[in-house]
Interface confidence: low
């Protein structure tokens, strides 16, 4: 799916109103570990693609995410503000219907959130730096900053 | 318990540069951006800029975009601030500070500040 | 950058009074219909101390006495009855436009 069109500013409210709280819930209850963020995005329909992958396809070790509810409330709000997008996911519903429902919250399942986490973030840093101007292409003003 | 550590206080030559570093604990340092801010005497508070450690990306006031350096060490969970080409103008109380874990923009997390002195 | 004039730049009352700090932002500061619009408290020898966020947000372990209002660029600090300890300076803060920006901050003092 392309994320081009999305309304990126219906999305950050989404996300800030209760996507953001539904993951720091999931994380709640962790050790103090790090994590390596092995994951980044440089752009706003990137940053979709790449949290798109991370909520919605199962991995060996983590296959229950598209379960839980920040990845319900992810997918009504791309449903919502991405055009089309519902009509690309039906295959996706299938497959996540077979995945399997872990009862424990493995420290894998903790990484891939953990990497969600930062990719939202950088959606949300890269939101409003590029109003009314297409993405920028130059490093040095594809500051992970700001912002709101 | 989450925490930020500075470094202590430092006495500089107008012209010289200022390393002050900020330690985190009890939290997973590499999914926060970490910012600085200074406040001289008697004076408000002003942004220099911010890091995410996760990828090493930084955002700079452009006041300080030229004399700043923001970097990181995810091994010993340190976010560091070098000052260069100091003047005296530069003396204030340097703070690192953690931004939000939701992406909002405040900061729920201060460090102690580190009291940087300029004088000749 | 966006100028965050804060006034009165000092205010004397007594405790048990109501204070209303204001902080004027010289652009919007609101976004997808939310204000990026922080409050901080700082006391003498202390780093800042979130108060609110977004506006009208308790920070943790905030006291119900203190409470926010605004959007776009006027925003209010309302404390309903002032504390011994509430006695410090008052920060606001907008993060909205890069770069980050706080206003000059309101001592508020004893009268």
């Known amino acids: 799916y392309d994320f081009t069109n999305c309304d990126f500013q219906k999305i950050e409210a989404d996300y800030l109103r209760t996507i953001s709280k539904d993951l720091i819930t999931y994380m709640s209850g962790t050790k103090s570990t790090d994590f390596n963020n092995t994951v980044s995005c440089s752009n706003r329909p990137h940053c979709l693609t790449e949290i798109q992958s991370l909520t919605f396809n199962p991995t060996p070790r983590c296959a229950s995410l598209a379960k839980e509810m920040f990845a319900r409330k992810t997918k009504a709000t791309l449903a919502l503000w991405c055009p089309g997008y519902s009509e690309t996911q039906i295959n996706a519903t299938q497959a996540m219907k077979k995945a399997r429902k872990s009862k424990v919250t493995t420290n894998k399942c903790l990484e891939q959130v953990s990497q969600l986490l930062g990719l939202w973030r950088r959606f949300i840093r890269t939101l409003l730096k590029q109003q009314g101007s297409s993405d920028y292409k130059d490093d040095d003003d594809k500051h992970h900053h700001h912002h709101h | 318990e989450a925490q930020l550590v500075q470094s202590g206080a430092e006495v500089k030559k107008p012209g010289s540069s200022v390393k002050v570093s900020c330690k985190a604990s009890g939290f997973t340092f590499s999914t926060y951006n970490m910012h600085w801010v200074r406040q001289a005497p008697g004076q408000g508070l002003e942004w220099i800029g911010a890091?995410?450690?996760?990828?090493?990306?930084?955002s700079y006031n452009q006041k300080f975009k030229d004399r700043a350096t923001l970097t990181v060490d995810k091994s010993t969970r340190t976010a560091y601030m070098e000052l260069s080409s100091l003047r005296s103008e530069d003396t204030a109380v340097y703070y690192c500070?953690?931004?939000?874990?939701?992406?909002?923009?405040?900061?729920?997390?201060w460090g102690q500040g580190t009291t940087v002195t300029v004088s000749s | 950058d966006i100028v965050l004039t804060q006034s009165p730049a000092t205010l004397s009352l007594s405790p048990g009074e109501r204070a209303t700090l204001s902080c004027r932002a010289s652009?919007?500061?609101?976004?997808?219909?939310?204000?990026?619009m922080h409050w901080y408290q700082q006391k003498p020898g202390q780093p800042p101390r979130l108060l609110l966020y977004?506006?009208?947000n308790l920070g943790s372990g905030i006291p119900a006495r203190f409470s926010g209002s605004g959007s776009g660029t006027d925003f209010t600090l309302t404390i309903s009855s002032l504390e011994p300890e509430d006695f410090a300076v008052y920060y606001c803060q907008q993060i909205n436009t890069d770069p980050l920006t706080f206003g000059q901050g309101t001592k508020l003092e004893i009268k």
């Open positions: 977004r506006a009208s």
């Open positions: 500070a953690r931004e939000d874990d939701y992406g909002e923009g405040y900061f729920d997390v």
């Open positions: 652009e919007s500061v609101d976004s997808s219909g939310l204000s990026f």
């Open positions: 890091i995410y450690p996760g990828n090493g990306e930084t």
